[in-house]
Protein backbone atom coordinates (compact mmCIF):
# COMPACT_ATOMS: atom_id res chain seq x y z
CA UNK A 1 0.00 0.00 0.00
CA UNK A 2 1.90 2.94 -1.12
CA UNK A 3 0.60 6.52 -0.76
CA UNK A 4 0.61 8.85 -4.12
CA UNK A 5 0.88 12.72 -3.38
CA UNK A 6 0.39 14.73 -6.67
CA UNK A 7 1.18 18.51 -6.63
CA UNK A 8 1.48 21.21 -9.83
CA UNK A 9 4.63 21.43 -11.57
CA UNK A 10 5.03 25.07 -11.86
CA UNK A 11 2.96 28.13 -10.17
CA UNK A 12 3.84 32.15 -10.65
CA UNK A 13 3.40 33.70 -7.28
CA UNK A 14 1.17 36.89 -7.92
CA UNK A 15 2.73 40.47 -7.78
CA UNK A 16 1.86 40.65 -3.85
CA UNK A 17 3.98 37.48 -3.38
CA UNK A 18 1.49 35.02 -2.73
CA UNK A 19 1.28 31.78 -4.40
CA UNK A 20 -0.96 28.88 -3.60
CA UNK A 21 -1.26 25.53 -5.15
CA UNK A 22 -3.02 21.90 -4.75
CA UNK A 23 -1.37 19.03 -2.69
CA UNK A 24 -3.49 15.99 -2.86
CA UNK A 25 -2.43 12.43 -1.90
CA UNK A 26 -4.13 9.28 -2.43
CA UNK A 27 -5.05 7.36 1.44
CA UNK A 28 -4.21 3.71 1.44
CA UNK A 29 -5.94 3.55 4.68
CA UNK A 30 -8.47 5.70 7.07
CA UNK A 31 -6.64 8.70 8.44
CA UNK A 32 -8.05 10.69 11.07
CA UNK A 33 -5.13 12.88 11.86
CA UNK A 34 -2.74 14.12 8.76
CA UNK A 35 0.66 16.04 8.75
CA UNK A 36 1.27 18.35 5.77
CA UNK A 37 4.75 19.82 5.29
CA UNK A 38 5.87 22.02 3.03
CA UNK A 39 9.76 22.10 2.37
CA UNK A 40 11.41 23.95 0.05
CA UNK A 41 14.74 22.64 -1.96
CA UNK A 42 16.80 25.25 -3.65
CA UNK A 43 20.71 24.38 -4.70
CA UNK A 44 20.84 21.28 -2.60
CA UNK A 45 19.48 23.24 0.62
CA UNK A 46 16.36 21.90 2.12
CA UNK A 47 14.38 23.70 4.78
CA UNK A 48 10.96 23.47 6.09
CA UNK A 49 8.39 26.31 5.04
CA UNK A 50 5.77 25.13 7.24
CA UNK A 51 3.82 22.41 8.80
CA UNK A 52 0.53 21.48 9.84
CA UNK A 53 -1.07 18.74 11.73
CA UNK A 54 -5.27 18.67 11.08
CA UNK A 55 -8.17 16.08 12.02
CA UNK A 56 -9.69 14.72 8.96
CA UNK A 57 -12.97 17.26 8.30
CA UNK A 58 -11.36 20.00 10.30
CA UNK A 59 -9.22 22.80 9.20
CA UNK A 60 -5.71 23.07 8.68
CA UNK A 61 -3.71 25.08 11.78
CA UNK A 62 -0.44 26.37 11.02
CA UNK A 63 1.37 28.15 13.77
CA UNK A 64 1.05 31.99 14.28
CA UNK A 65 3.90 33.13 12.55
CA UNK A 66 3.66 30.55 9.86
CA UNK A 67 4.00 32.36 6.41
CA UNK A 68 1.67 29.58 5.13
CA UNK A 69 -2.12 28.76 5.44
CA UNK A 70 -4.63 26.43 4.26
CA UNK A 71 -7.57 24.53 4.13
CA UNK A 72 -8.78 20.53 3.72
CA UNK A 73 -11.07 19.24 1.53
CA UNK A 74 -11.28 15.15 1.66
CA UNK A 75 -7.11 13.92 0.78
CA UNK A 76 -7.06 17.61 -1.04
CA UNK A 77 -4.80 20.20 0.72
CA UNK A 78 -5.03 23.72 -0.89
CA UNK A 79 -1.71 25.96 0.68
CA UNK A 80 -1.02 29.55 0.10
CA UNK A 81 2.33 30.63 1.08
CA UNK A 82 2.73 34.45 1.83
CA UNK A 83 5.34 37.42 1.66
CA UNK A 84 7.38 35.61 -0.97
CA UNK A 85 10.03 37.34 -2.66
CA UNK A 86 12.42 36.63 -6.16
CA UNK A 87 14.70 35.20 -3.68
CA UNK A 88 12.16 32.58 -2.39
CA UNK A 89 12.24 31.41 -6.04
CA UNK A 90 12.43 27.02 -5.67
CA UNK A 91 10.83 24.17 -5.34
CA UNK A 92 8.02 23.87 -2.95
CA UNK A 93 7.06 20.21 -1.79
CA UNK A 94 4.52 18.73 0.14
CA UNK A 95 5.31 16.02 2.47
CA UNK A 96 2.34 14.31 3.65
CA UNK A 97 2.18 11.90 6.81
CA UNK A 98 -0.77 9.59 7.87
CA UNK A 99 -0.44 10.16 11.66
CA UNK A 100 -3.45 8.30 13.61
CA UNK A 101 -4.28 5.78 13.87
CA UNK A 102 -1.30 3.07 12.91
CA UNK A 103 -0.28 1.99 10.51
CA UNK A 104 1.89 5.45 9.87
CA UNK A 105 2.38 6.04 5.84
CA UNK A 106 4.59 8.79 4.11
CA UNK A 107 3.92 10.75 1.03
CA UNK A 108 6.03 13.32 -0.68
CA UNK A 109 5.44 15.14 -3.87
CA UNK A 110 7.36 15.86 -7.12
CA UNK A 111 7.41 19.19 -5.76
CA UNK A 112 5.92 22.75 -7.31
CA UNK A 113 8.52 24.83 -8.54
CA UNK A 114 7.15 28.54 -7.64
CA UNK A 115 8.67 31.58 -9.37
CA UNK A 116 8.30 34.62 -7.90
CA UNK A 117 8.99 37.99 -9.57
CA UNK A 118 9.58 41.21 -7.65
CA UNK A 119 7.70 44.22 -8.94
CA UNK A 120 8.98 47.26 -10.54
CA UNK A 121 9.13 50.17 -8.26
CA UNK A 122 6.47 52.49 -9.25
CA UNK A 123 8.12 55.50 -10.75
CA UNK A 124 7.79 58.93 -9.02
CA UNK A 125 5.16 61.10 -10.86
CA UNK A 126 5.53 64.45 -11.65
CA UNK A 127 2.29 66.75 -11.74
CA UNK B 1 26.40 19.99 16.30
CA UNK B 2 23.53 17.09 16.71
CA UNK B 3 24.34 15.09 19.41
CA UNK B 4 22.26 12.22 21.00
CA UNK B 5 23.27 10.16 24.15
CA UNK B 6 21.50 7.43 26.24
CA UNK B 7 21.53 6.21 29.27
CA UNK B 8 19.47 3.90 31.94
CA UNK B 9 20.63 0.55 30.53
CA UNK B 10 21.50 -2.05 32.59
CA UNK B 11 21.09 -5.83 34.12
CA UNK B 12 17.40 -6.40 35.30
CA UNK B 13 15.42 -9.13 36.24
CA UNK B 14 12.46 -10.40 34.01
CA UNK B 15 9.10 -8.83 34.77
CA UNK B 16 10.88 -5.70 35.99
CA UNK B 17 11.11 -2.03 34.67
CA UNK B 18 13.71 0.06 33.57
CA UNK B 19 13.92 3.58 32.14
CA UNK B 20 15.94 4.56 28.76
CA UNK B 21 16.73 8.37 28.67
CA UNK B 22 18.28 10.38 25.28
CA UNK B 23 19.67 13.74 25.34
CA UNK B 24 19.61 15.70 22.51
CA UNK B 25 21.34 18.74 22.03
CA UNK B 26 22.03 20.53 18.36
CA UNK B 27 18.29 20.62 17.29
CA UNK B 28 14.85 20.91 18.48
CA UNK B 29 12.52 17.50 19.43
CA UNK B 30 9.34 18.15 18.35
CA UNK B 31 10.56 19.16 15.30
CA UNK B 32 11.55 15.94 14.53
CA UNK B 33 9.52 12.25 14.52
CA UNK B 34 12.48 10.41 17.31
CA UNK B 35 13.01 6.70 17.47
CA UNK B 36 14.21 3.57 19.24
CA UNK B 37 16.06 1.17 17.69
CA UNK B 38 17.64 -2.09 19.12
CA UNK B 39 20.02 -4.65 18.30
CA UNK B 40 20.49 -7.97 20.23
CA UNK B 41 23.53 -9.66 20.47
CA UNK B 42 25.08 -10.48 17.45
CA UNK B 43 21.92 -10.16 15.54
CA UNK B 44 20.40 -7.42 13.34
CA UNK B 45 18.66 -3.84 13.78
CA UNK B 46 15.10 -3.93 15.01
CA UNK B 47 12.65 -0.56 15.11
CA UNK B 48 11.07 -0.35 18.50
CA UNK B 49 9.10 2.85 18.43
CA UNK B 50 8.76 6.36 17.53
CA UNK B 51 7.46 9.73 19.46
CA UNK B 52 6.11 11.70 16.79
CA UNK B 53 6.23 15.86 16.49
CA UNK B 54 3.92 17.42 19.20
CA UNK B 55 4.54 13.94 21.08
CA UNK B 56 0.86 13.15 21.37
CA UNK B 57 1.31 10.46 18.15
CA UNK B 58 3.31 7.48 19.59
CA UNK B 59 3.75 4.18 17.45
CA UNK B 60 4.92 0.54 18.57
CA UNK B 61 6.16 -2.42 17.07
CA UNK B 62 4.60 -5.05 17.86
CA UNK B 63 6.81 -6.88 19.73
CA UNK B 64 6.70 -4.08 22.50
CA UNK B 65 3.23 -2.78 22.32
CA UNK B 66 1.54 -2.56 25.80
CA UNK B 67 4.91 -2.84 27.38
CA UNK B 68 7.16 -0.25 26.27
CA UNK B 69 5.84 3.89 26.93
CA UNK B 70 7.39 7.06 24.92
CA UNK B 71 7.79 10.28 26.76
CA UNK B 72 9.12 13.48 25.97
CA UNK B 73 10.53 16.40 28.04
CA UNK B 74 10.71 19.53 25.76
CA UNK B 75 12.48 21.62 28.93
CA UNK B 76 15.02 19.13 28.98
CA UNK B 77 15.14 18.30 25.49
CA UNK B 78 15.22 14.79 26.43
CA UNK B 79 13.28 11.47 25.05
CA UNK B 80 12.40 8.37 27.54
CA UNK B 81 11.57 5.51 26.55
CA UNK B 82 9.87 3.56 29.59
CA UNK B 83 10.31 -0.51 29.53
CA UNK B 84 8.02 -2.38 31.72
CA UNK B 85 7.60 -6.49 32.29
CA UNK B 86 10.87 -6.42 30.70
CA UNK B 87 11.59 -10.45 29.08
CA UNK B 88 14.75 -12.17 28.03
CA UNK B 89 14.41 -11.22 24.56
CA UNK B 90 14.38 -7.79 25.09
CA UNK B 91 18.28 -7.84 25.94
CA UNK B 92 20.03 -5.85 23.52
CA UNK B 93 21.71 -2.49 22.79
CA UNK B 94 19.32 0.27 22.59
CA UNK B 95 20.00 3.38 20.11
CA UNK B 96 17.95 6.58 20.17
CA UNK B 97 17.62 7.83 16.27
CA UNK B 98 16.71 11.07 14.53
CA UNK B 99 14.33 10.97 11.42
CA UNK B 100 15.47 12.71 8.48
CA UNK B 101 13.76 15.36 6.65
CA UNK B 102 12.50 13.91 4.11
CA UNK B 103 11.25 10.65 6.33
CA UNK B 104 11.75 7.98 8.66
CA UNK B 105 15.52 7.24 8.00
CA UNK B 106 17.87 7.53 10.22
CA UNK B 107 20.25 10.06 10.09
CA UNK B 108 21.56 10.31 13.76
CA UNK B 109 22.47 7.70 16.47
CA UNK B 110 23.16 7.64 19.66
CA UNK B 111 26.02 5.73 21.05
CA UNK B 112 23.68 2.79 22.57
CA UNK B 113 22.99 1.85 25.56
CA UNK B 114 23.24 -2.01 27.17
CA UNK B 115 20.47 -3.47 28.77
CA UNK B 116 20.65 -7.16 29.92
CA UNK B 117 17.36 -8.79 31.17
CA UNK B 118 18.46 -12.08 33.22
CA UNK B 119 17.83 -13.48 36.46
CA UNK C 1 4.53 -5.30 7.58
CA UNK C 2 7.20 -5.40 4.63
CA UNK C 3 9.79 -8.11 5.00
CA UNK C 4 13.30 -7.12 3.82
CA UNK C 5 15.63 -9.69 2.73
CA UNK C 6 19.39 -9.18 1.75
CA UNK C 7 22.05 -11.16 -0.50
CA UNK C 8 24.85 -12.12 0.17
CA UNK C 9 24.58 -12.71 3.25
CA UNK C 10 28.78 -12.58 3.46
CA UNK C 11 30.36 -10.94 0.57
CA UNK C 12 34.04 -11.70 0.91
CA UNK C 13 36.38 -9.31 -1.49
CA UNK C 14 39.58 -7.59 -1.55
CA UNK C 15 40.24 -3.90 -1.34
CA UNK C 16 39.94 -2.04 -4.50
CA UNK C 17 37.13 -4.40 -5.66
CA UNK C 18 33.09 -3.82 -6.40
CA UNK C 19 30.61 -5.01 -4.42
CA UNK C 20 27.21 -5.50 -5.22
CA UNK C 21 24.57 -5.65 -1.91
CA UNK C 22 21.03 -6.32 -3.02
CA UNK C 23 17.90 -5.72 -0.59
CA UNK C 24 14.48 -7.10 -1.80
CA UNK C 25 11.39 -6.01 -0.39
CA UNK C 26 8.13 -8.18 0.10
CA UNK C 27 5.85 -5.97 -1.16
CA UNK C 28 6.28 -2.69 -3.07
CA UNK C 29 8.34 0.35 -0.93
CA UNK C 30 6.74 3.05 -1.84
CA UNK C 31 8.71 6.26 -3.65
CA UNK C 32 11.87 4.20 -2.99
CA UNK C 33 12.18 5.30 0.55
CA UNK C 34 14.22 2.96 1.46
CA UNK C 35 18.12 3.71 3.35
CA UNK C 36 21.26 1.88 3.38
CA UNK C 37 23.56 2.21 6.43
CA UNK C 38 26.74 1.03 7.90
CA UNK C 39 27.92 -0.80 10.72
CA UNK C 40 31.20 -1.47 12.22
CA UNK C 41 32.02 -3.85 15.58
CA UNK C 42 31.25 -1.67 18.27
CA UNK C 43 29.75 1.74 16.87
CA UNK C 44 26.38 2.79 15.99
CA UNK C 45 24.74 2.27 12.11
CA UNK C 46 25.44 5.40 10.51
CA UNK C 47 23.23 6.41 7.53
CA UNK C 48 24.70 6.04 3.78
CA UNK C 49 21.51 6.74 1.45
CA UNK C 50 18.57 7.61 1.37
CA UNK C 51 15.78 7.95 -0.85
CA UNK C 52 17.27 4.85 -2.56
CA UNK C 53 19.65 6.92 -4.16
CA UNK C 54 20.47 10.12 -2.51
CA UNK C 55 23.73 10.38 -0.47
CA UNK C 56 23.94 11.15 2.90
CA UNK C 57 26.06 13.90 4.06
CA UNK C 58 29.68 13.27 4.20
CA UNK C 59 29.48 10.10 2.34
CA UNK C 60 31.84 9.43 -0.25
CA UNK C 61 30.95 9.42 -3.67
CA UNK C 62 31.99 5.84 -4.01
CA UNK C 63 29.03 4.78 -2.09
CA UNK C 64 25.68 4.64 -4.43
CA UNK C 65 22.19 3.47 -4.66
CA UNK C 66 20.14 2.50 -6.85
CA UNK C 67 16.06 0.47 -7.44
CA UNK C 68 12.74 1.21 -7.25
CA UNK C 69 9.82 -1.19 -6.11
CA UNK C 70 10.53 -4.23 -4.53
CA UNK C 71 14.85 -4.26 -6.13
CA UNK C 72 17.36 -2.55 -4.57
CA UNK C 73 21.27 -1.89 -4.85
CA UNK C 74 23.99 -0.83 -2.96
CA UNK C 75 27.29 -0.20 -4.54
CA UNK C 76 30.32 0.46 -3.50
CA UNK C 77 32.76 1.38 -6.42
CA UNK C 78 36.28 0.49 -5.55
CA UNK C 79 36.47 -1.02 -1.62
CA UNK C 80 38.52 0.91 0.97
CA UNK C 81 40.16 -0.71 3.94
CA UNK C 82 37.49 1.19 5.92
CA UNK C 83 34.55 -0.27 4.25
CA UNK C 84 34.49 -3.61 5.41
CA UNK C 85 31.42 -3.80 8.24
CA UNK C 86 27.93 -4.75 7.72
CA UNK C 87 25.14 -3.25 5.67
CA UNK C 88 21.45 -3.03 6.58
CA UNK C 89 18.52 -1.92 4.21
CA UNK C 90 15.68 0.32 5.72
CA UNK C 91 12.32 0.65 4.64
CA UNK C 92 10.39 3.73 6.19
CA UNK C 93 7.39 4.12 3.66
CA UNK C 94 5.28 2.91 6.47
CA UNK C 95 5.05 1.61 9.89
CA UNK C 96 6.33 -0.73 11.13
CA UNK C 97 10.12 0.60 9.97
CA UNK C 98 11.64 -2.32 9.34
CA UNK C 99 15.46 -3.41 8.40
CA UNK C 100 17.31 -6.62 6.41
CA UNK C 101 18.88 -8.94 7.78
CA UNK C 102 22.04 -7.12 6.87
CA UNK C 103 25.02 -8.02 4.55
CA UNK C 104 28.38 -8.68 5.75
CA UNK C 105 31.43 -7.20 3.92
CA UNK C 106 34.74 -9.03 4.65
CA UNK C 107 37.84 -9.09 3.75
CA UNK C 108 38.96 -11.89 1.25
Known amino acids: KAMHVAQPAVVLASSRGIASFVCEYASPGKATEVRVTVLRQADSQVTEVCAATYMMGNELTFLDDSICTGTSSGNQVNLTIQGLRAMDTGLYICKVELMYPPPYYLGIGNGTQIYVIDPEPCPDSDF | QVQLVESGGGVVQPGRSLRLSCAAS????????MHWVRQAPGKGLEWVAVIWYDGRNKHYADSVEGRFTLSRDNSKNTLYLQMNSLRAEDTAVYYC????????????WGQGTLVTVSS | EIVLTQSPGTLSLSPGERATLSCRAS???????LAWYQQKPGQAPRLLIY???SRATGIPDRFSGSGSGTDFTLTISRLEPEDFAVYYCQQYGSSPFTFGPGTKVDIK
Open chain 2, 26 to 33: GFTLSNYG
Open chain 3, 27 to 33: QSVSSSY
Open chain 3, 51 to 53: GAS
Open chain 2, 97 to 108: ARGGVWGSYFDY
